[in-house]
Interface confidence: medium
């Protein structure tokens, strides 16, 4: 039992850290391996995470962690029975992957614009709530060349799109992801897509009948 790619870990900086690694052969992760983790702080308890398979040889472990602070460091030990496969440390504040933004919806707005809205995935009291910026990807479902990327660097989780910048009568999908610049985080996963039909004739003719949005 050997590790091919050592664990790579990220924290959502509120409740969960996720580690992923690759074994040198197909492995039943939950039956053969355990990841033990412990906060490097006197009196902290040792915990054990049971990994799951992401692929035949790829294991992933989701570890509940307390609301993190910048100085927290965790000691990680990957075991196959009594064999120590890998040992390392992990500092959540240096490896932040924000939670995925939620509830992306599309609404018709005044002046022939679409209003895209989503929810900040962090409660107001969390450090990351006010640190997030977003990237919104808008793409034409029938034309792979027709896509736009918008960076939302202001606080509010909203984006206004002029309907005239999109092709009339076409179906568009939007998705959003987040990152935390001050934590030098990676991007979050993309939110589920929301799809709508783009018209820029007078809104009132089309609202009930044509406008719809749903999650894939």
């Amino acid at each position: 039992v050997k590790v091919l790619h050592e664990p790579s870990c990220f924290s959502d900086y509120i409740s969960t850290s996720v580690c992923q690694w690759k074994m040198d052969h197909p492995t039943n992760c939950s039956a053969e391996l355990r990841l033990s983790y412990q906060l490097d702080f006197m009196g902290s308890e040792n915990h054990t995470c049971v990994p799951e398979n992401r692929e035949d040889s790829v294991c992933v472990c989701s570890m509940p962690i307390d609301d993190a602070v910048e100085a927290d460091v965790y000691q990680l030990d990957l075991w196959a029975g009594q064999q120590l496969l890998w040992s390392g440390s992990f500092q959540p504040s240096k490896h932040v992957k924000p939670r995925t933004p939620g509830n992306l919806t599309v609404h018709p707005n005044i002046s022939h614009t679409w209003l895209l809205m989503w929810t900040n995935p962090y409660p107001t009291e969390n450090h990351l709530h006010s640190e997030l910026t977003y990237m919104v990807n808008v793409s034409n479902d029938n034309d792979p060349e027709d896509f736009k990327v918008y960076n939302v660097t202001y606080m509010g989780p909203t984006l206004r799109l002029a309907a005239s910048t999109l092709k009339s009568g076409a179906s568009y999908s939007a998705r959003v992801r987040a990152w935390a610049q001050t934590y030098n985080s990676t991007w979050s996963d993309w939110s589920p897509s929301t799809t709508w039909l783009n018209y820029y004739e007078p809104w009132e003719q089309h609202l009930p009948h044509h406008h719809h949005h749903h999650h894939h």
């Epitope: 039992v1 412990q38 040792n46 029975g81």
Partner: antibody, heavy 116, light 107 residues
Amino acid sequence: QVPLQQSGPELVKPGASVKISCKASGYAFSSSWMNWVKQRPGKGLEWIGRIYPGDGDTKYNGKFKGKATLTADKSSSTAYMQLSSLTSEDSAVYFCARDDYDEASWGQGTLVTVSA
Amino acid sequence: DIVMTQSQKFMSTSVGDRVSITCKASQNVRSAVAWYQQKPGQSPKSLIYLASNRHTGVPDRFTGSGSGTDFTLTISNVQSEDLADYFCLQHWNYPFTFGSGTKLEIK
């Protein structure tokens, strides 16, 4: 079904060798370490070493190097321990043990008696 | 080699009591400690792995705790069938080493 079935008791003469076996069942023999443990009458436990049947990798307690040789036969899912140059100090019960988290199991033990 | 010291050779307790068996490592062994129960004339049985995790089928009155150098096996609500020797094992460094054992006697 007993996960680890060890061979029966052995009475051997000083200076001789003995080979005891541990037959595994009910799990992937090749992908779990097999440990061997010594227990003298009324005494504690001593770790002899372990073998990884998948590739034959062995780890020994320095105290037992040259005394114990660990091997494994994947085709029969059997681990073996040979003890050589036996003396009265080697009289003991020897256990094989697989200890992988919730899959922990120990053999019933093999009593080796060294006597002229 | 790492020495695992079980300073209590014998412990006497009564049914229903709570008893704590300790094990001290001569150096930091992280959480790499297992606990075993051996009843007279039987093979050892694995109780606890990685310091604090109960094996499947082990009653929840057995609890492991500790990390680094100090480890404890606690038996709450002791039962007569808990009469046995208890051993700790470190598997952080080769060679793995056992504690000398603690014999639990029931009054």
